[in-house]
Structure formats: C-alpha cells, structure tokens
C-alpha cells in the first residue's frame, strides 16, 4: 500500500493551524470499515490520532488534532493540527493499514516571526565623540533561533564587540538580545537585522547617534522615528524618553500619553504618582525608570484597533511632546489550495484554483506564478474580508486552462512583516484527481 506525504517540511506559524497531508490509494470497493489509520510521533511512537473499526477514535494529542472524515474514503488521511506550539515540531508518521499496510513520515517545522527590534543606548544622553556606547537590539517571541547581523550606515558589517543571547520562554519562543559596543564618531547609524532562518523573515531597526548636548530649558522628548510594529495579541512598548535636569523629582512630572488624533487619554502620571490606564486597562508605565527619564508605555494584548499615533507629552517646568506610531500586524497562515473541479481533469479543461490564507493584518498582497516562476496576472480575483477583530481572510481565485501538466503557486505577502506565505499545487497526468490519489 502506497502512502504519500509531502517531501518538504510543513511550515506552521505558532498559534495557527497546520495540515499534515497524507494520502493513500483505496482499491475499488474499499470501505472505511476496513481502514486502520494511525498518526503517531515518529521518534517516540506516541499516538496522536487514529481511525479504526469504521470510526474516528479521536485525538490522543491534547485534543488539538482532527482528521478530514468526509475525505477519508477517497484516500485523504491528512491530519489537522490546531493552535500549533513550538513543542509540536518534529516528525509525524502516517500509518495506513487496509489489507496491506504502508506508512510515511512528514516533518512539521514550527516558526514564529520576530518582532521589529527595539534599540536602546547606554548611556543615552550627553554623548560626545569618543564616548563608548552600548547599543542593545532586542527582538521578541520568534522561533526558531534567529541570526543577528549588525552593520553601519554604509552597510559595512560590524562583527567585533558583539554579544548575542537568545532565551526561550515557557512556550519555547525566543527573545533575542544582541549587544554592540562602539566608540562614537561625529555621528553614526547602527543597524541591527534579526533573521528568522525558516521564514526567511528579516526584522530590522537602526539608531542614528548624533553626539551633542541638549539645550537647557526645554524638555526634549524623544521617540523612535520608525513605527513600532507589534503583532496582534503580543505586548508593545511605545518608547519615549526625556532628559531630566539635575535635582529632578517625580513630584514635578506631568506625563500624559494620549491618542494623537482624538486626544483621548491613554495613561498618565501626575501629582507624583501613576494615575493608571484610561485605555481598557491595557497600558502600563515603567515606574522604576521614570526618574531616569524613561516615559515609555507598555501596551498589552495589542489589537488591530490600537493602530495609530500616540503622543507622549511631558511637562516639568517647560513641556515637550512627540508622537510615536504603532503599526499592528498579524502573520498570514500558510495558504490552503483548492481546485474546482477537482477530479477527472484533462488538458484543455478550465479549472478554478482558490488560494486561501487567514487572519493576517494589514491587507495582503497576493501573487500567482507558474512552475517557471512566470507571474500569472490574468483571470485573478482576490477578495479580503476583515473579521470582528479586524484581521483579514484572503481568498484569491485563479482561472486557468490546463496544459499537459503544470504547477501553480500562490504567494500571500504581509507588507508590514515582509512575511511571505506560499502554497502551490501541481497538476500532472491525464486524467487525474486532486488531491492526488497515488
């Protein structure tokens, strides 16, 4: 009995659902009563899901797996794994027994995009040429371990005096902290690039240091020039700093975070104390750092509706303010591909290929191409619908006339994360059925 699975690993984003494809060729007269299907972890042989005695025996794997019962009779033994975790990574064996038996193993590669790096300087004020400064680049909640690269404003790699550490949290996701020590010139730009080797996703940030003394009197309020990019459901830090004068005390401080456009109050500190969140109880200051001039705001469990500009207003004797933009993003799931019609296909037939990718933000860019990489632009219709959370489901439909055989690829790009999710379907032979039965 021939059991077929994809050669390439299935790449799944943490928190999304993954389909581990597996198919077999049922003989004429085959009935599900004859089928014995077992999914198990290849290394430990731990049972994951099974079908026996004519019925689905259910998930033995944290209740997060499901078969496709309506497709089993046609030989589709694929397994749906929900809410993928880092711990799910590895090899899964699909074992099929009817009269004969066969098995094949499919690899699941788990991935999570790294957040846009945040950059911090130490020391961060009164910098002069010749000073040694420590630049820390931090990127959060990615998987697998990242590759980190530093370069100067001219693109020249900086490899000396770099220390990078990666720590996994309880979910197995990595927080990356890379430290570069440099001696300041008259001014300089330092860029940090955090690469996810599986997703081929690059997240980068840079800091430009112009050593100088702040003019006295004014409250210089500094925020990042680039938007802060935050993944839906994660926490974001909106960085804001000011330069406290000698003798400054928190009793003098009036700090207000508000939405730039509507002036709606988000969070405040006055009368020497944190007045708390006025924004759905999802914001917090860094109280231990305020006296040093760190007025940053932590925004928890980011939602699409949070996207926009936030103003950090600081008043001591004088006042100053600056606005920081929050750009919300959510990675798109690996596209699922469907064919209509999906059986008895012959060259010359017109077929509709639908590529669907879910729960991303902002709206995606969708590209189709053939097996040679030639873009397919004609007869493509793409629709994007936002759900209640503001996340988009993308459905792109390509109508093609079949040749003798052909591969059709769909690429769904998240323009903010620069994350590409792709799916493809290969249609060969004549006549044929999709999914392939053998």
């Amino acid at each position: 009995l021939e059991v077929q699975v994809p050669e390439d690993p299935v790449v799944a984003l943490v928190g999304t659902d993954a389909t581990l494809c597996c198919s077999f060729s049922p003989e004429p007269g085959f009935s599900l009563a004859q089928l014995n299907l077992i999914w198990q972890l290849t290394d430990t042989k731990q049972l994951v899901h099974s079908f026996a005695e004519g019925q689905d025996q259910g998930s033995a794997y944290a209740n997060r797996t499901a078969l496709f019962p309506d497709l089993l009779a046609q030989g589709n033994a694929s397994l749906r794994l929900q809410r993928v975790r880092v711990a799910d990574e590895g090899s899964f064996t699909c074992f099929v027994s009817i009269r004969d038996f066969g098995s094949a193993a499919v690899s699941l590669q788990v991935a999570a995009p790294y957040s846009k790096p945040s950059m911090t300087l130490e020391p961060n004020k009164d910098l002069r040429p010749g000073d040694t400064v420590t630049i820390t680049c931090s990127s959060y909640q990615g998987y697998p371990e990242a590759e980190v690269f530093w370069q100067d404003g001219q693109g020249v790699p900086l490899t000396g005096n770099v220390t990078t550490s990666q720590m996994a949290n309880e979910q197995g996701l990595f927080d990356v902290h890379s430290i570069l020590r440099v001696v300041l010139g008259a001014n300089g730009t330092y860029s940090c690039l955090v690469r996810n080797p599986v997703l081929q996703q690059d997240a980068h940030s840079s800091v430009t240091i112009t050593p100088q003394r702040s003019p006295t009197g004014a409250v210089e309020v500094q925020v990042p020039e680039d938007p802060v990019v935050a993944l839906v459901g994660t926490d974001a830090t909106l960085r804001c700093s000011f330069s406290p004068e000698p003798g400054f005390s928190l009793a003098q401080l009036n700090l207000i975070w508000q939405l730039t456009d509507t002036k709606q109050l988000v969070h405040s500190f006055t009368e020497g104390r944190d007045q708390g969140s006025a924004y759905a109880n999802r914001t917090a200051l860094f109280p231990d750092l305020l006296a040093q001039g760190n007025a940053s705001l932590r925004l928890q469990r980011v939602r699409v509706a949070d996207e926009g500009s936030f103003t950090c207003f600081v008043s001591i004797r004088d006042f100053g303010s600056a606005a920081v933009s929050l750009q919300v993003a959510a990675p798109y799931s690996k596209p699922s591909m469907t064919l209509e019609p999906n059986k008895d296909l012959r060259p010359g037939d017109t077929v509709t290929i639908t590529c669907s990718s879910y729960r991303g933000y902002p709206e995606a860019e969708v590209f189709w191409q053939d097996g040679q990489g030639v873009p397919l632009t004609g007869n493509v219709t793409t629709s994007q619908m936002a759900n209640e959370q503001g996340l988009f489901d993308v459905h792109s439909v390509l109508r093609v006339v079949l040749g003798a055989n052909g591969t059709y690829s769909c690429l769904v790009r998240n323009p903010v994360l620069q994350q590409d999710a792709h799916g493809s379907v290969t249609i060969t032979g004549q006549p044929m059925t999709f999914p392939p039965e053998a």
Partner: antibody, heavy 119, light 108 residues
Amino acid sequence: EVQLVESGGGLVQPGGSLRLSCAASGFTFSSYGMSWVRQAPGKGLELVATINSNGGTTYYADSVKGRFTISRDNAKNTLYLQMSSLRAEDTAVYYCTRNEEFRRGLAYWGQGTLVTVSS
Amino acid sequence: DIQMTQSPSSLSASVGDRVTITCRASENIYSNLAWYQQKPGKAPKLLVYAATNLADGVPSRFSGSGSGTDYTLTISSLQPEDFATYYCQHFWGTPPWTFGQGTKLEIK
C-alpha cells in the same frame, strides 16, 4: 522685574495677514514656554497658541490651526504670532504670557495688543 | 479637548459676603487648575494655581479647593476691589489649556 510687551496689532482686512511680537525682559527667556491668549470684545479668554522653550513643540487652538504660527527667537528674547487668512472672529486683544513651572498657571501677562479684522 | 464649565455666569453680592464660584472639567484634571481675576481694560491676574495654592501677593480671603473634575474659588469676605470677572483654566494634558467662560461678580 518680568516684563512682556506686545506690538504689531492694528486694523486688517478679512483674508489679510499680521505679525504680532512680544518683547520679553527680566527673566531668562530661553528657559520658559510662552503662550498667546486672546479675548474678543465682551467675551472670555481663549488660549490661541503655545510654544516650548526651545521652539521645538507648538500647539494651537482648533479655531486658528493652519492659519496662525507661533515662533520665537531666543537670541532676541522675542515671541511671535504670525496670523494669516484673518477673519472677523479673530478680532480681539492678544496677550503674550509666560508659561510657569508645571501647574503654576500663567503668572505674567503683557498689556495686550488689539487686532481688528474688518473691511 | 477638555471643556471647562463655570457657574454661575454672573453673580450679585455685597461687600462682606462669602462668595463661591465653581468650575467643572469634562474629565479628571488632577488639580491642574488655575483661577484668574480680570478687571475691565486690564490683563488677567493669577490668583490660585494647582487648585489650592495662592499666587504671590494674593490676599488670604481668596482660597481654592477641589479635586478630580470639580473645583471651587471662594472669597470669604468680599471687598470693593474684588468686583471683577473670574476665570478658571486647566493645565492638564496637551495644550491648548482651555478657560472657563467666566463669572462676572457684580455689586448688589
């Protein structure tokens, strides 16, 4: 002694422009934020524009946004209000004021300069 | 922007009376409030800052109180020179820091 002296007011036609100046003395001008407050005849007070000590941050009342510009020259100890696209409702006495330390109000005011917008 | 509502808009009283003027903010302004006195043809004069603190040279018959959204200016015993228009102004949040519409205090 802190002194604020406004100048530049006068009669201007609707749609016209005018620049008010405020000469400051008796304090370190470059260390304080400054504001312009106006009062239409028989009406209340309205804070029109404010600027911080180095001129890097400015704010405006919605009624003048896009038409008025507040600026300062710390070397000359002078505050300015450039007014353009003037309307009849901009007719008012314009006061120059010093922003005090956090929460301390506007303790110092100039004597005011009258701007009349009329055809 | 935060709205400041003063009441009453006008008030008649006699010398020696105790007078109270109130100011209500459209949201919590955390005691970031000042009171001014203005006489005809003159610039306003600061009386009270940070809701309760008397400005330099202001007689002790003036006092300020309140917190959150509700604030009060009290003159314990009216003197002839106190007949004027009074304004409140908040200093909370980003400018423009708005004024109340004013209370005209007249001789009865």
